[in-house]
């Protein structure tokens, strides 16, 4: 081998050792969620900084990941810190700065008090009530801490309380009280004035427990103007379009992962159905039509059966005389007897039945039983947004499903159309067979997101029972990320913009509220939140 080639080969080997490459090919349909994993850290050392870049451009995202069980969401409400499966250790003071961690421009973010932890965190002592003042039942057994300029300070509650302040939620809009196991979203500043572009750094301060290492993030000018989720080493791009195709490179220390993303485009009608929950109108209309047609078919069927019975009775009547007739040419019933009703042929109804079932199945089947996990885990959709006004507590954000068609998405019904169409099995060829058709294409779901029957609808969390419930297993981003955030960002707004709904301080599931929260997700054009009085849009907590 000539020396220059040998040298080049050795150089290649050396570079290969310094910067091992992992090549991934990801192919997906337009509208599905792209999950881009970065190579894992070496098990020892500190978590390395991640740098994501695209094609031949410079980095678009730089991230110091922080502890496990944390994530970042980049979207219309700015950059949000996500804390999954909140535990007592995660209570405390959350500070942030629109700067890298090395700078000293920290500002108060949010306090998080975890129910039952025995600790209460407030930015201001005044939010605990007057001197010696308790805050309802909780504070009698809780040690309050207040922020004293640059550190937490134990607050001594005196024996007397001059002016009781009522319950826990009557505190600063930057003070949150959440249930253990819930998921909390924190903005840096109150939206819409929260940090939206980066850099942004987060810090957690607890007076008596080790502080959690929180992520810091920088979005550069090259950053795509789109929604993104960062869950540890995973970058998730929900609802990809053709513009998202290309090569993504993740550098982590001296490791590099190259991910080639290919997007297969869908027909224009698909976009129309997907756009801004536009599919609800045709689906509801279709369901209504199917219901009406089902009723009509049932009625005609019944009527026909009665007439047939009557005629059969008449024909078998021994007092009646039978005579042979020559059938007229044409489409009439090919019977040699006169008073005979044409019976349907074995296949006559199948095509139409399959079409109906397919059109319904396409809408309903992919959702499976969306509530199964929620019911297992408790009220997964409930918010823990403090200090909502009494009017807001009335719950205008949650409407009852007001028609059969609506509730079919939420209840564990069998396919109604299938039931209606196959009640008289004799009329159809294979009444037990599942209808084949558009539902096989998963036509109303986003790629694999709703593959499993027990997957939940609501982003950003899936398998609620696993990692949102207090007894859930540890959160594993690599396992969970695949089906995170499967709604479009327009749908997501429903979650964050829903009027703050105060969760009762008594723990307990609220299934109706859950079903409704899914309904709300599909209302992107609903009223924008009033960030003033409540001021909690930047945070959302599920139980």
């Amino acid at each position: 081998m000539p020396p220059p080639l040998l040298l080049a080969f050795l150089l290649f080997l050396t570079l290969g050792r310094v910067r091992p490459q992992k090549l991934l090919q990801v192919e997906m349909e337009e509208g599905s969620d792209a999950v881009l994993p970065c190579l894992q850290d070496p098990p020892d050392g500190p978590p390395e900084r991640l740098i994501w870049s695209r094609d031949s451009q410079g980095p678009f995202l730089e991230l110091s990941p922080g502890s496990p069980g944390l994530g970042i969401h980049v979207g219309r409400l700015g950059i949000l810190l996500l804390i999954f499966n909140v535990s007592n250790e995660m209570g405390g003071f959350y500070l942030c700065q629109p700067a890298p961690p090395s700078q000293q421009a920290w500002q108060p973010g949010w306090t998080v008090s975890v129910e039952g932890s025995g600790e209460l965190f407030r930015w201001n002592a005044s939010d605990l009530g007057g001197p010696g003042c308790g805050l309802g039942n909780e504070s009698s057994s809780s040690q309050p801490y207040v922020w004293d300029r640059d550190h937490p300070k134990e607050w001594d509650m005196g024996p007397a309380c001059a002016s009781p302040r009522g319950d826990l939620n009557q505190s600063s809009s930057l003070d949150l009280t959440v249930a253990p196991g819930s998921t909390v979203w924190l903005s840096c500043g109150v939206p819409p004035a929260s940090v939206a572009t980066g850099p942004v750094s987060w810090a957690h301060i607890h007076p008596t427990k080790p502080n959690i290492l929180l992520p810091s993030l920088n979005l550069t000018a090259e950053s795509p103007a789109r929604e993104m989720w960062v869950l540890g080493p995973v970058l998730m791009l929900p609802q990809v379009t053709a513009v998202d195709a290309g090569m993504y490179v993740c550098r982590r220390g001296n490791l590099t992962t190259e991910i080639h993303v290919t997007i297969t485009v869908r027909p224009a009608i698909w976009h129309w159905l997907q756009r801004k929950s536009g599919w609800i109108v045709p689906v509801v209309a279709l369901l209504y039509l199917i219901f009406c047609l089902g009723c009509l078919v049932s009625f005609l069927h019944l009527r026909r059966a009665l007439i047939l019975r009557r005629k059969r009775k008449r024909m078998t009547d021994p007092t009646r005389r039978f005579f042979k007739v020559t059938p007229p040419a044409g489409n009439g019933a090919q019977s040699q007897y006169g008073n005979v009703l044409s019976l349907p042929t074995p296949t006559s109804g199948t095509g139409r039945a399959q079409r109906w079932a397919a059109s319904l199945g396409g809408a309903a089947a992919p959702y499976g039983h969306p509530l199964s996990d929620v019911q297992e885990a408790g009220a997964a959709g409930s918010r823990s947004l403090p200090r909502a006004s009494p009017e807001e507590e009335e719950g205008e954000a949650y409407e009852e499903p007001d028609s059969e068609a609506d509730s079919e998405f939420y209840e564990n019904d069998s396919n109604p159309a299938q039931d209606q169409l196959s009640q008289d099995g004799s009329g159809y060829e294979n009444p037990e067979e599942e209808p084949s058709g558009p539902e096989d294409d998963d036509s109303f779901s986003n790629a694999e997101s709703y593959e499993n029957e027990d997957e939940e609808l609501a982003p950003p969390v899936t398998r609620t029972a696993d990692f949102l419930s207090p007894h859930g297993s540890a959160w594993d981003p690599s396992r969970e990320a695949v089906s995170l955030g499967s709604q479009s960002y327009e749908d997501m707004r429903g979650i964050l913009y829903a009027a703050p709904q105060l969760r009762s301080s008594r723990p307990g599931p609220s299934y109706e509220e859950d079903a409704d929260s899914y309904e709300n997700m599909d209302n992107p054009d609903g009223p924008e939140p009033a960030w003033g009085a409540g001021g909690h849009g930047g945070t959302w907590s599920t139980r």
Partner: antibody, heavy 122, light 107 residues
Framework: QVQLQQSGPEVVKPGASVRMSCKAS????????IHWMKQRPGQGLEWVGC????????NYNEKFKGKATLTADKSSSTAYLQLSSLTSEDSAVYFC???????????????WGQGTLVIVSA | DIVMTQSPATLSVTPGDRVSLSCRAS??????LHWYQQSSHESPRLLIK???QSISGIPSRFSGSGSGSDFTLTINSVEPEDVGVYYC?????????FGGGTNLEIK
Amino acid sequence: QVQLQQSGPEVVKPGASVRMSCKASGYIFTNHYIHWMKQRPGQGLEWVGCIYPGNVNSNYNEKFKGKATLTADKSSSTAYLQLSSLTSEDSAVYFCARGGYYGSSYSWFAYWGQGTLVIVSA
Amino acid sequence: DIVMTQSPATLSVTPGDRVSLSCRASQSISDFLHWYQQSSHESPRLLIKYASQSISGIPSRFSGSGSGSDFTLTINSVEPEDVGVYYCQNGHSFPYTFGGGTNLEIK
């Protein structure tokens, strides 16, 4: 109560390196920065840099970049200052002090170690 | 870097005197100014934080004032044990910087 225990005096040759330690007790080591200060005989205090043991994030005074290296061992709650390529200019007492929380503007030092004397001599 | 200048360099006082030590920053540092006392062969001791906040365990005769770039440490009635060097520290931004010190002597 909070205590910072520094290692003993060091006499080293020019060009060599020295590593001194600061063992913390009485608080959660990973929650607070450890700062290092240099004081030459009969002179004032100079801030060398600081390290946050929670994420090993460190900040240096430009003057000491390349000279000082800060590390921390969470398991033993000990912070280290290593000085390389020593000259007589590095002869000084080095103090460690507990700083504030990562994420706060806490920039004052209520707790100090007793100091480690480093003498660079041929 | 922010330069901290202390004056006077040395101050000789009689016990019971009221003394003021001055510290000036080369740029505004709001109230991010802390005062320390260092006795001979000892570690520095925090006296005042954030220009005027007292520290528990520190005698009430020590008080601080000022904001922006001009600061003062006042000792109301000097005691013999107050001898030592007094340093002011910029805590506004990295790198933290200290003044050259004021050496307080008892006559």
